[in-house]
Interface confidence: medium
């Protein structure tokens, strides 16, 4: 039975040209995290594998930095980066947990972080 929950940074906003940290946290389970995938709508951004470390998708090598931790840093933001991002936690023995983050990239200098929320 899957008892864990994914806590994410929820709805966040950032300035064009700036950076943002995408962060998820798996709690309420003793399952072992074997891999975390980061996806943007229909594309893979990166993978963090417990044994092998990080794989950054070639399309994003110049703009994505691993970490902190299992999170992901997105750099040189453009308005086109606005949209949904997903953290997919592969765990043993529970299976797969998915968290969602919505990022809005703003032209102006007004960029506030949204509240944290949980996805069971």
């Amino acid at each position: 039975m899957m008892t864990g929950t994914i806590e994410t940074t929820g709805n966040i906003s950032a300035e064009k040209g700036g950076s943002i940290i995408l962060q998820c946290h798996l709690s309420s389970t003793t399952a072992q995290v074997t891999q975390v995938n980061w996806e943007q709508q229909d594309q893979l951004l990166a993978i963090c594998n417990a044994d092998l470390g990080w794989h950054i998708s070639p399309s994003f090598k110049d703009r994505v930095a691993p970490g902190p931790g299992l999170g992901l840093t997105l750099q040189s933001l453009t308005v086109n980066d606005t949209g949904e991002y997903f953290c997919i936690y592969h765990t043993y023995p529970d299976g797969t947990y998915t968290g969602r983050i919505f990022l809005e990239v703003l032209e102006s200098s007004v960029a506030e972080h949204g509240a944290r929320f949980q996805i069971p």
């Epitope: 594998n49 092998l52 470390g53 997919i88 592969h90």
Partner: antibody
């Protein structure tokens, strides 16, 4: 355990398009665990990576073949495919489909020989 | 593009002997990104080692991998008749490349 099986014509004429399909069994092609790739091996020679696709549709190709290659995924059939256009005799090879963890290729099809000849 | 050079091209040994196969990269490769495969005639390659030193599922412990940076080694501690085959190293940097292979033949 994953099993992969290539299918498609064994003979293709020069300048035409080579088309192969890989059917995946023992697991879902929609798994975010895997990339789905193609590798080829000319007779008596070494291995050359062609490209891969992620289940969400993002692709990455060997730069030397990029202009001629298309890899697509059909999640409803648990298949992915390779198209290589404007083939020449140099494209004659055994073509393998394989699953990749992003770092290495862990499951392979048995391979299918494609000969380019008129 | 990272070029992998394997040596020797052919290695002639007898069953029971120790085999040492080398793979040298043209630039530094993360250990996580180095794998070894075995290929027998008419068969697909089979993953032996990943992450430079981790054995794949079902691979006997006589196979071991080591190395870092630009120099990697596959060692078969005591050759069995079924080990005679072609061995390839493979790396993942920004794209996948394979070495040209080492043929391990019976002496």
């Amino acid at each position: 355990q994953l099993q992969l099986q290539e299918s498609g014509p064994g003979l293709v004429k020069p300048s035409e398009t080579l088309s192969l399909t890989c059917t995946v069994s023992g697991g879902s092609i929609s798994s975010s665990r895997y990339f789905w790739g193609w590798i080829r091996q000319p007779p008596g020679k070494g291995l050359e990576w062609i490209g891969y696709i992620y289940y969400r549709g993002s692709t990455y190709y060997n730069p030397s073949l990029k202009s001629r290659v298309t890899i697509a995924v059909d999640t409803s059939k648990n298949q992915f495919s390779l198209k290589l256009s404007s083939v020449t005799a140099a494209d004659t090879a055994v073509y393998y489909c394989a699953s990749s963890s992003a770092w290495y290729f862990d499951y392979w099809g048995q391979g299918t020989l494609v000969t380019v000849s008129s | 593009e990272i070029v992998l050079t394997q040596s020797p091209g052919t290695l002639s040994l007898s069953p029971g002997e120790r085999a040492t196969l080398s793979c040298r990269a043209s630039q530094s490769v993360s250990s996580s990104y180095l794998a070894w495969y075995q290929q027998k005639p008419g068969q697909a390659p089979r993953l032996l080692i990943y992450g430079a030193s981790s054995r794949a599922t079902g691979i006997p412990d006589r196979f071991s991998g080591s190395g870092s940076g630009t120099d990697f080694t596959l060692t078969i501690s005591r050759l069995e008749p079924e080990d005679f085959a072609v061995y390839y190293c493979q790396q993942y940097g920004s794209l996948y490349t394979f070495g040209q292979g080492t043929k391990l033949e019976i002496k």
